[in-house]
Interface confidence: medium
């Protein structure tokens, strides 16, 4: 099989406050074995925004039911955007291990937020 | 109920081919992830190979990779192998299963056909 | 190749008897393990998945436990249905998804 790739078609999106935010991400292959997870920022700071394995995140829901093999899409959509959401989002593939093990990420997505329209 | 029925299953001779089906009822065919796994005489359970749920993604098993072809038609609920090259010990009940995962990359089967015969000797 | 061992290759259990029935691996998969069922003739049923999780319609006398590298399927009071073949398999990671030797049940 060919090496996974995590792509991120999206360079930048800008999206109006209060409105939501889809961030595109796919995958082409289900090998290594492993989840996806979302962060903002890059490095040991980086926020992490979804987890596909477990976790609660409110505002976070997926464009397509990624938690069954229905595709190897991981599209999100963050609701009720603010300035405090702008930032580079990654989309990273993790391989299954103990604990599990970063393989890959995509090259971002820039969030802009503009002002809500009045 | 879920249903799979596999056919085409049958005697050839090493090197020829052979064509196996699978009917799928009782559930959204589409969503989920298909596989063959086969059991020769007398003999434990292997998998030969899985397709994912659009057909863009296909995984083997060493022993038929380059030999066998796994496809799916969603529009007619059906899982095939295409089997060439046949040898003696791809002799086996072959078994259509359903995944039944919960996470994409995990799998496992919680459903299978009966199974149909394929017997590869001179 | 994640390899997975069952022991013992047969077991003899009188009806009414409990059966402990082993899955070892060759390396750590979590609990990432299914468990299932074949009689002779017959497909292959799913018993357990997630190394202790119940099937849909799986009655409570099966259970399964461990992580890691080893794994118990228990059945607390055989039936005379349960004398069957039973095998382990892991999906911690694929290709290949491998399944173990197989442990026979049968009445003693």
């Known amino acids: 099989e060919e090496e996974l790739q995590v792509i991120q078609p999206d360079k930048s999106v800008s999206v109006a406050a209060g409105e939501s935010a889809i961030l595109h991400c796919t995958v082409t292959s289900l090998i290594p074995v492993g989840p996806i997870q979302w962060f903002r920022g890059a490095g040991p700071a980086r926020e992490l925004i979804y987890n596909q394995k477990e976790g609660h995140f409110p505002r976070v829901t997926t464009v397509s039911e990624s938690t069954k093999r229905e595709n190897m899409d991981f599209s999100i959509s963050i609701s009720n955007i603010t300035p405090a959401d702008a930032g580079t989002y990654y989309c990273v593939k993790f391989r299954k291990g103990s604990p599990d093990t970063e393989f890959k990420s995509g090259a971002g997505t820039e969030l802009s937020v503009r002002a809500k329209p009045s | 109920d879920v249903q799979l029925v596999e056919s085409g299953g049958g005697v050839v001779r090493p090197g020829e081919s052979l064509r196996l089906s699978c009917a799928a009822s009782?559930?959204?065919?589409?969503?989920?992830?298909m596989s063959w796994v086969r059991q020769a005489p007398g003999e434990g359970l292997e998998w030969v190979s899985l397709?994912?749920?659009?057909?863009?993604?296909?995984y083997y098993a060493d022993s038929v990779k380059g030999r066998f072809t796994i496809s799916r038609d969603n529009s007619k609920n059906t899982l095939y192998l295409q089997m060439n090259s046949l040898r003696a010990e791809d002799t086996a009940i072959y078994y259509c299963?359903?995944?039944?995962?919960?996470?994409?990359?995990?799998?496992?089967?919680?459903?299978w056909g009966l199974g149909t015969p394929v017997t590869v000797s001179s | 190749e994640i390899v997975l061992t069952q022991s013992p290759g047969t077991l003899s259990v009188s009806p009414g008897e409990r059966a402990t029935l082993s899955c070892r691996a060759s390396?750590?998969?979590?609990?990432?393990l299914a468990w299932y069922q074949q009689k002779l003739g017959q497909a292959p049923r799913l018993l357990i998945y997630?190394?202790?999780t119940r099937a849909t319609d799986i009655p409570d006398r099966f259970s399964g436990s461990g992580s890691g590298t080893e794994f118990t399927l228990t059945i607390s009071s055989l039936q005379s249905e349960d004398f069957a073949v039973y095998y382990c398999?892991?999906?911690?990671?694929?290709?290949?998804?491998?399944f173990g030797g197989g442990t026979k049940v049968e009445i003693k």
């Open positions: 398999q892991h999906y911690y990671d694929w290709p290949p998804v491998t």
């Open positions: 997630d190394a202790n």
């Open positions: 299963a359903k995944d039944g995962a919960a996470h994409y990359y995990d799998i496992f089967f919680d459903y």
């Open positions: 009782g559930f959204t065919f589409s969503n989920y992830a």
């Open positions: 397709i994912t749920t659009n057909g863009d993604g296909a």
């Open positions: 390396q750590n998969v979590r609990s990432d």
